[in-house]
Amino acid sequence: CTCVPPHPQTAFCNSDLVIRAKFVGTPEVNQTTLYQRYEIKMTKMYKGFQALGDAADIRFVYTPAMESVCGYFHRSHNRSEEFLIAGKLQDGLLHITTCSFVAPWNSLSLAQRRGFTKTYTVGCEECTVFPCLSIPCKLQSGTHCLWTDQLLQGSEKGFQSRHLACLPREPGLCTWQSLRSQIA
């Protein structure tokens, strides 16, 4: 299973649920579905209030039981470490894959934290982070922001990922804007 890691704003906008949580148990494999689930302790929710409704406490995260079918395997044994988890809701259950955005909270830049807590949501409706994977690449719309981190850095941990968000400048136009200047 291979996938290009998304810009964190894309991960935020394309996910049904974005939370901060600790992984508190070893995975359990369901004898019927062959999906595995991890027990988690949610500490914050950044997106998904409406989708969840009253069931606002997520206790488990579900993923395929094998790497080759995009299953997520949690390698950290530190049960007090917090992770940012962006996933999809299926039948009221939080699902993630290898391609989901799952990262230690402490590994995120201050700008990214600001993005997840406040700013990325502003760009979800109108703006699109457009990956530029090979030259030449051009903007297909004024609401697109060209994401060149992978081209220039060979990594999703580039400057645009760590410090910028694609936000509306004016109707029909989105541009990269610094999250650092907005940090409280």
């Epitope: 070893t26 494999v29 004898q31 019927t32 579905t33 039981a65 080759s68 299953g71 395997f73 390698r75």
Partner: antibody, heavy 114, light 110 residues
């Protein structure tokens, strides 16, 4: 009590095909994933393939991927393993097993030889 | 391609205790609490002796016990009896290969 009965084994030439069946009884078949495990003569156990209770998810060992197909018919309480492009190294006793592999059948012998 | 490492053979006298180890990695034994142990007599199908690391199915003698530390699981048989002579296999879920077995250990009761 739980019973798993395999059938369909036999002698087949290299490159040939065979379809194994496993008839299950004594439990709610659709509530359990099922696996095929094999054991070559004088050798250890090797997991071959697994399928979820609904049949929607399937998994294969690298050694059989692209050649074997696991399936199930929940209305007949039966598990299948379609084996194509058989090789000499596929010679083994094939067992079907339930869930986390708590119950096993008695096995059926597949011999691939010219 | 054996995924879990077991000793090829162990032996003990009647009444003694023996332990069989099963070493894997953090993506199998160390990553899941799903280690099982099977007993297989010649010409017979394997029989489940221990599941979920340390649980015994009903009907299995309490002389059989299982444990796990890190990436290594262990099966202990106390008060060895002649009928315990058999091959023993460990098995675990594995994130990369889905399910893996050990190479097997031949137990001889002297």
């Amino acid at each position: 009590q739980v019973q798993l009965v395999e059938s369909g084994g036999g002698l087949v030439q290299p490159g040939g095909s065979l379809r194994l069946s496993c008839a299950a009884s004594g439990f709610t078949f659709s509530s359990y994933a099922m696996s095929w495990v094999r054991q070559a003569p004088g050798k250890g156990l090797e997991w071959v393939s697994a399928i979820s209770g609904s049949g929607g998810s399937t998994y294969y060992a690298d050694s059989v991927k692209g050649r074997f197909t696991i399936s199930r018919d929940n209305s007949k309480n039966t598990l299948y393993l379609q084996m194509n492009s058989l090789r000499a190294e596929d010679t083994a006793v094939y067992y079907c097993a339930r869930g986390h592999v708590d119950y096993w059948g008695q096995g059926t012998l597949v011999t691939v030889s010219s | 391609d054996i995924a879990l490492t077991q000793p090829a053979s162990v032996s003990g006298s009647p009444g003694q205790s023996i332990t069989i180890s099963c070493t894997g990695t953090s993506s199998d034994v160390g990553g899941y609490n799903y280690v099982s142990w099977y007993q297989q007599h010649p010409g017979k199908a394997p029989k489940l002796m221990i599941y979920d690391v340390s649980n015994r199915p009903s009907g299995v003698s309490n002389r059989f016990s299982g444990s796990k530390s890190g990436n290594t699981a262990s099966l202990t048989i106390s008060g060895l009896q002649a009928e315990d002579e058999a091959d023993y296999y460990c098995q675990s879920y594995d994130f990369v290969r889905f399910m893996v077995f050990g190479g097997g250990t031949k137990l001889t009761v002297l």
